[in-house]
Interface confidence: low
Amino acid sequence: NLSQDDSQPWTSDETVVAGGTVVLKCQVKDHEDSSLQWSNPAQQTLYFGEKRALRDNRIQLVTSTPHELSISISNVALADEGEYTCSIFTMPVRTAKSLVTVLGIPQKPIITGYKSSLREKDTATLNCQSSGSKPAARLTWRKGDQELHGEPTRIQEDPNGKTFTVSSSVTFQVTREDDGASIVCSVNHESLKGADRSTSQRIEVLYTPTAMIRPDPPHPREGQKLLLHCEGRGNPVPQQYLWEKEGSVPPLKMTQESALIFPFLNKSDSGTYGCTATSNMGSYKAYYTLNVNDPSPVPSSSSTYH
């Protein structure tokens, strides 16, 4: 003896990304010699058993048996969202409803507001916007591996009344370490299934130069050739160099090249050397104390020639 519930069809709610495919599956234990039917939110019949009722090539039959009717809808649009009804025409008619939720995929974010010629310690403000998400997406900011705390995401309904445009801005003080850094705005949304959808803005920061003096060879000896390299860093890179030997008044100006060359080191070359590296952002002076070591021991005459 079958209970009345055996003729009650069942189905499930489905979530699909816009442009994707959703499968609607309806099952019944006792069909009572009746066919299953699927209809859309507008109450138009889609399939009655294995018979197509609506001319829409996106809708295809997957399974039609006395106990199951499954159909697929491809290239799902936001307008397809709503309650789909599975019916079985027993006495009385029994129905089951499947709520189809269509996710709107957020567009690739757009970053605006970048102003070039940022200087160290300036404040930068960037704006990020992404349209088309449903439900509303969330925006996050990062600089390299570091998360930036932007304003909370602002949400605005798109003209279609279904999707949303989200926007956020971030403000931060730039340092010289930010020169060449990428500020990334990422959109987080369930439709992306963890995939990254982001836009980056590379920033340039102008900053005062620094310099370091590097000896080549590192441990110079009397009689050797020595190059002192003045390695200037900055943005812009220093273009002017001035070498001075300290201790004389005024200091002895030696060369305006980035490298100071000693073709043949003397003990008298010992002393403190200064290199001033200059760009249009300013100047920086680095110092190097040169101690000329004794020459390497001369090999004995017996091993000089072979």
């Epitope: 160290e120 310690k121 340092t175 010289r176 370490e177 620094t210 310099a211 370091m212 003096i213 590097r214 000896p215 590192p218 860093r233 920086y284 680095a286 110092y287 190097y288 104390t289």
Partner: nanobody
Framework: QVQLVESGGGLVQPGGSLRLSCAAS????????RGWFRQAPGKGREFVAA????????NYADSAKGRFTISRDNSKNTVYLQMNSLRAEDTAVYYC?????????????????WGQGTLVTVSS
């Protein structure tokens, strides 16, 4: 966990000497610059001296030139500040600092890791 630990501070008479040490642990700092800064009571933090990754290039504040010497021993991951001819105005907390990159910088903004500081008091 990056740690910089200063030592060697203390009370010294004017004209005396002290040698400060800064030991680094948690990562190899031998490829990075290192700097000493100081902060006197009621004043801001000021640059004292810095040394590049090889020890070949050093830089000193005007107040430290000729009296202080910065050096490093990469095998011990330690940087030293030898302070001679100390004056009362050298009284301060001395901080060791290291940047997170190889890029040299001689001002405080260029440094990412800081020690807790060691107190140097110059008084008769």
């Amino acid at each position: 966990q990056v740690q910089l630990v200063e030592s060697g501070g203390g009370l010294v008479q004017p004209g005396g000497s002290l040698r400060l040490s800064c030991a680094a642990s948690g990562r190899t700092f031998s490829n990075y610059a290192r700097g000493w800064f100081r902060q006197a009571p009621g004043k801001g933090r000021e640059f004292v001296a810095a040394i590049d990754y090889s020890g070949g290039s050093t830089n000193y504040a005007d107040s430290a030139k000729g009296r202080f010497t910065i050096s490093r021993d990469n095998s011990k991951n330690t940087v030293y500040l030898q302070m001679n001819s100390l004056r009362a105005e050298d009284t301060a907390v001395y901080y060791c600092a290291a940047p997170a990159s190889r890029r040299p910088s001689w001002d405080a903004d260029g440094y990412d890791y800081w020690g807790q500081g060691t107190l140097v008091t110059v008084s008769s």
